[in-house]
Structure formats: structure tokens, C-alpha cells
């Protein structure tokens, strides 16, 4: 999908008031410096195309992120917000449901997310130059 | 304007099934996920599951799992939630209820169908 | 599963009185995730406040709300007949989402 159509504004809005707090959140407990972040974004739409894959596709060691609290408001917000994106995603989640398993907080999610914040807060700076 | 229609009430019979729907209108229906609310006679609000029309993804609270099937026809903009084997207990008001970001960004249920009474009766 | 505990149950207040509700939240929660309904006898609930303290659409500014944590609490601050309703109070911070049982407001 291609996130360059986004409303941008409203996203980020609604990343501030809600999905910011869910993050916090589901990494309560975990110091802020514990991980090191890895995954980068130059732009808004490029922000949006990692967030949606760290998010939503599943990976080794964490296949349950897409059912947490933040990544349903992220999916609403995605939804709402970037023209098209709902009809895009009935292949992404048929794959998402035959690679969920129980919901457990593994340190490889928490790894994940923290990665997210970080996109996030990158996503809100736009710009700012990379590092 | 948005708008939530649901289906009319009903009286079935113990050990059957019911499908009550919930037409939705003014508002992009693949979009925003919509939620299932039930309501006993005089009793509080209690959720159900909800189900995000555009890919069919759905979340249950763990009380109506088994009970419950959330579907959705986006080419008639509906969704609609299936009750099986029915009981006494299943007798209520059941809200189809849409969620989504308010004017301030906060995540709620801003607009409601009127509510489906199902009676379950021998 | 969050539980939330709405006191008092049932009240009765007098035009013109302050009301205040209260609702307990078993584990601390974002106040943007702490929402108020209204619901009125044989009709469906109304989003009444939002994230603890922003008032929908259409609210009377005798309305307030306010909270953090596990404490938050709907105030009218000058009762008036049309303010009569059930009020509860919905958490979106974790499944599955849950309400309060609700509070029964009475005109006295």
C-alpha cells in the first residue's frame, strides 16, 4: 500500500491522543533504554509502511502484536485516515490469522514495540533530519 | 449522516439460532470497526466482539466465544451477529455499536444502532 | 479483565443539585481510554464524555468529567430534569472492553 495519500495530521492526532498511551502501556515495566532501536524511517509515508509491517505481519518470536489494543486503533486510524487502505489488507490478514498464536508478552514483542515507539516518534518529526 | 440500522425483534425458540444485522449508512462501512453490545432486561452493558468490515478481522471477549459469529457484507454495507444454541440467558437488547476517533482523537463507540430485542421462549 | 466499579448505583437528586458519579477502575488506565454513556429507558446509549473529560457533541456544559488512574467521576453541576438518565462508564485500554454496571440518576 502506498501511505502518501494519508492524512497525516489526523494520524498523527490520533497517535498522540490514544495509540501513544496503549504503547506506553503495553511496555509497562520495561526500562526505555533497555532496547536499541533498529528499524528507521526517512518520511511520513515511509514511517506509516513500517509501522503498518512491524505492527501487523508476524515475526519470529512475536506473532500476537496484531491483536494488542494500539494495533486495532492504529488499524482504525490506517483505515480511516489513508483512501484505500481497508480493501488492501483482506490478504494481510487471512496470513496474520493462520500465524496467530495465544496472546504472550515475549521479550522479542516488547523488542518490537519499543521499535514501533520509535517509528512513531519519528512519524511526529517529520522535519527532522535523520540521524 | 451516520446511521446504524438494525433488524427487527425476535422470539426463538431454546436450542436455535438467531441472525440479527445492523445496515450501516453515511460513513465509509469497510473503515471503521463495529462493535456488538448486549443489554438484559434492567442489567448493564456488556461487550460482545467486534469485527472490522474491510478484511473481516474480528475480536471476541472471551464470554461469548462459541456463542457469537460476527460477519460483514461490505457490498450491503451490514454487519451482522449470529447467536447459537439459544438459552433464557440469551434473552436481551443486543446494540450494534460503530467505533471510531471523536473530534478530539479519543477512541469510543460514537454511534449506535437502536437495538435488536431477541426472546428466547418455548 | 478490567473491572469497573460505579458508585453509587441508583441516586436521586433535586434541580439544581451537584451530582457527582463515581467510577473505580480495578487496574490503572490512560484517562484518554475512560469514557462516559448516557442511556435513557428503551433506547440506545449516548457517548456522553470522552477520554475522561471532553464533552460529545451536543453535551450541556453542566457536564464534567475528571479522573486518573483508577479514579474518575462524571459531574452535573446543577441537576435539571432532562439529566435523568443511567450513566456508565467504558474502558478502551484492554480486552475485553468493559463498562460499569451504571449509575441510576433519579429527579427528586
Known amino acids: 500500500y502506498d501511505f502518501t495519500n494519508c492524512d497525516f495530521e489526523k494520524i498523527k492526532a490520533a497517535y498522540l491522543s490514544t495509540i501513544s498511551k496503549d504503547l506506553i502501556t503495553y511496555m509497562s515495566g520495561t526500562k526505555s533504554t533497555e532496547f536499541n532501536n533498529t528499524v528507521s524511517c526517512s518520511n511520513r509515508p515511509h514511517c506509516l509502511t513500517e509501522i503498518q509491517s512491524l505492527t501487523f505481519n508476524p515475526t519470529a518470536g512475536c506473532a500476537s502484536l496484531a491483536k494488542e489494543m494500539f494495533a486495532m486503533k492504529t488499524k482504525a486510524a490506517l483505515a480511516i485516515w489513508c483512501p484505500g487502505y481497508s480493501e488492501t489488507q483482506i490478504n494481510a490478514t487471512q496470513a496474520m490469522k493462520k500465524a496467530r498464536k495465544s496472546k504472550v508478552t515475549t521479550n522479542k514483542c516488547l523488542e518490537q514495540v519499543s521499535q514501533l515507539q520509535g517509528l512513531w516518534r519519528r512519524f511526529n518529526r517529520p522535519l527532522l533530519k535523520q540521524q | 449522516q451516520v446511521q446504524l440500522q438494525q433488524s427487527g425483534a425476535e422470539l426463538v425458540r431454546p436450542g436455535s439460532s438467531v441472525k440479527i444485522s445492523c445496515k450501516s449508512s453515511?460513513?465509509?462501512?469497510?473503515?471503521?470497526?463495529m462493535n456488538w453490545v448486549k443489554q438484559r432486561p434492567g442489567q448493564g452493558l456488556e461487550w460482545i466482539g467486534q469485527?472490522?468490515?474491510?478484511?473481516?478481522?474480528?475480536t471476541y471477549n472471551g464470554n461469548f466465544k462459541g456463542k457469537t459469529t460476527l460477519t460483514a457484507d461490505k457490498s450491503s454495507n451490514t454487519a451482522y451477529m449470529q447467536l447459537s444454541s439459544l438459552t433464557s440467558e440469551d434473552s436481551a437488547v443486543y446494540f450494534c455499536?460503530?467505533?471510531?476517533?471523536?473530534?478530539?482523537?479519543?477512541?469510543?463507540?460514537?454511534?449506535w444502532g437502536q437495538g435488536t430485542s431477541v426472546t428466547v421462549s418455548s | 479483565e478490567i473491572v469497573l466499579t460505579q458508585s453509587p448505583t441508583l441516586m436521586a437528586a433535586s434541580p439544581g443539585e451537584k451530582v457527582t458519579i463515581t467510577c473505580s477502575v480495578s487496574s490503572s488506565i490512560s484517562s484518554s481510554n475512560l469514557h462516559w454513556y448516557q442511556q435513557k429507558s428503551e433506547t440506545s446509549p449516548k457517548p456522553w464524555i470522552f477520554?475522561?473529560?471532553n464533552l460529545a457533541s451536543g453535551v450541556p456544559v453542566r457536564f464534567s468529567g475528571s479522573g486518573s488512574g483508577t479514579s474518575y467521576s462524571l459531574t452535573i453541576s446543577n441537576m435539571e430534569a432532562e439529566d435523568a438518565a443511567t450513566y456508565y462508564c467504558?474502558?478502551?485500554?484492554?480486552?475485553?472492553?468493559?463498562f460499569g454496571a451504571g449509575t441510576k440518576l433519579e429527579l427528586k
Open positions: 453515511g460513513y465509509a462501512f469497510s473503515s471503521y470497526w
Open positions: 467504558q474502558q478502551w485500554s484492554s480486552y475485553p472492553l468493559t
Open positions: 469485527i472490522f468490515p474491510g478484511d473481516g478481522d474480528t
Open positions: 455499536a460503530r467505533s471510531g476517533f471523536d473530534y478530539g482523537y479519543f477512541y469510543a463507540m460514537d454511534y
Open positions: 477520554g475522561t473529560s
